[in-house]
């Protein structure tokens, strides 16, 4: 029996700048029923503070909701291991909310093969912006990536669409359905996971040519 | 709505106890840092207590470090402040206060009032 | 601890008029400070947190500015219910402090 080891804070993630999660691995355990809590301060405070929410965000995480989150204040925190036999700290982890955000995937995905008259047909998509964060605060800037491939092909074709939240494709091999995804990422920050595919089937006289 | 009452306060003579609750409602008490601040027409407004969510993290003023105790039961959401060895200077408006916003306490009970006095 | 002085002590105005209040602390407190009413027999009321940040339900008449050591709580038109007493506060390090307080009162 010993006392815990050492644990980690691996990630800490916010969907918009407005809450953040934190989550961390526990050390070992010694062989004893071990308790953890996560306290913190923020930069220029030397009042220390609790966890507010270790429920949200599953186990060993700590979710801090609206009225605990600043943009503008950077966060030190560890997170304590405790058992019978003593206790154990995680490293201090200095987190800027600005630089953790994962927003949700893109919303309201929609493909559609444009065949105009006059011009060479092209594959039209369009998306929406994640729900939880809103643009015209100016607070964010998001980025689009697409993902398209052939239903049956290994390899994605990726396309950046920088700012804009419609896209046009027109290389594409006739008669073949596709599986198209998009996902979004601040400008500090990480990429969202993708959206669930759209498929699309792509008609047989559709035209490569350029 | 949220409501915060205290009660428990009283005259006590210089050396006896009293033990102060505070019951909450009207939110997540469990997550919430909570506070004793008491008010004297001497000294004002003097903050003498604070527990964190969970107990983990407790602070006292030196004014009543090794006298007074904070306590909690978030299953009943319930604050507690238990006075030891009282003297005539902790008499006192006693209020409790949960924080909501950074740690500034938004709500306030109406506070009890604590006599010391023999 | 960090001491906190509130100039002035009483401040006369008439309705309609601007208030300002001033705070000082004895070592800096970053923007972890805040103001509070108090009006006789109630518990204090939240006004500013952070400095300049409203509390909810709080007029826009009320405003907080400083950052440090020095900070101002400004009403911009006073009106009739704001005649109380207003105490800043820090809540950078334990133990958290107020200032004695600054009595606004009708002139």
């Known amino acids: 029996q010993l006392p815990p080891g050492k644990p980690e804070i691996f990630k800490c993630r916010s969907p918009n700048k407005e809450t953040f999660t934190c989550w961390w691995r526990p050390g070992t355990d010694g062989g004893l029923p071990t308790n953890y809590s996560l306290t913190y301060h923020r930069e220029g405070e030397t009042l220390m503070h609790e966890c507010p929410d270790y429920i949200t965000g599953g186990p060993n995480s700590c979710h801090f909701g609206k009225q605990y989150t600043s943009m503008w204040r950077t966060y030190i925190m560890m997170v304590n291991a405790t058992n019978q036999m003593g206790s154990s700290f995680s490293d201090e982890l200095y987190v800027d909310v600005t630089y953790i955000v994962q927003p949700d995937p893109p919303l309201e995905l929609a493909v559609e093969v444009k065949q105009p008259e006059d011009r060479k047909p092209y594959l039209w998509i369009k998306w929406s912006p994640p729900t939880l964060i809103d643009l015209k605060t100016g607070w964010f800037t998001l980025l689009y990536e697409i993902r398209l491939k052939p239903e049956k092909a290994a390899e994605w074709e990726i396309h950046f669409a920088g700012q804009q939240t419609e896209f046009k494709i027109l290389s594409l091999h006739p008669g073949q359905k596709y599986l198209v995804q998009v996902r979004c990422k601040p400008d500090h920050g990480y990429w969202s996971a993708w959206s669930p595919a759209t498929f699309i089937q792509i008609p047989s006289d559709f035209t490569m040519n350029d | 709505e949220v409501h915060l009452v205290e009660s428990g306060g009283g005259l006590v003579q210089p050396g006896g106890s009293l033990r102060l609750s505070c019951a909450a409602s009207?939110?997540?008490?469990?997550?919430?840092?909570m506070n004793w601040v008491r008010q004297t027409p001497g000294k004002g407004l003097e903050w003498i207590s604070h527990?964190?969510?969970?107990?983990?993290?407790?602070y006292y003023a030196d004014s009543v470090k090794g006298r007074f105790t904070i306590s909690r039961d978030n299953a009943k959401n319930s604050l507690f402040l238990q006075m030891n060895s009282l003297r005539a200077e902790d008499t006192a408006v006693y209020f409790c206060?949960?924080?909501?916003?950074?740690?500034?306490?938004?709500?306030w009970g109406q506070g009890t009032l604590v006599t010391v006095s023999s | 601890e960090i001491v906190l002085t509130q100039s002035p002590a009483t401040l006369s105005l008439s309705p309609g008029e601007r208030a300002t209040l001033s705070c000082r602390a004895s070592?800096?407190?970053?923007?972890?400070f805040a103001w509070y009413q108090q009006k006789p027999g109630q518990a204090p009321r939240l006004l500013i947190y952070?400095?300049?940040s409203r509390a909810t339900g709080i007029p826009t008449r009320f405003s907080g500015s400083g950052s440090g050591t020095d900070f101002t709580l400004t009403i911009s038109s006073l009106e009739p219910e704001d005649f109380a007493v207003y105490y800043c506060?820090?809540?950078?390090?334990?133990?958290?402090?107020f200032g004695q307080g600054t009595r606004l009162e009708i002139k």
């Open positions: 206060a949960g924080i909501t916003i950074f740690g500034i306490p938004e709500y």
């Open positions: 009207g939110f997540t008490f469990s997550s919430y840092e």
């Open positions: 527990i964190s969510s969970r107990s983990v993290i407790i």
């Open positions: 070592q800096s407190v970053s923007s972890y």
């Open positions: 952070d400095a300049s």
């Open positions: 506060q820090q809540r950078s390090s334990w133990p958290i402090t």
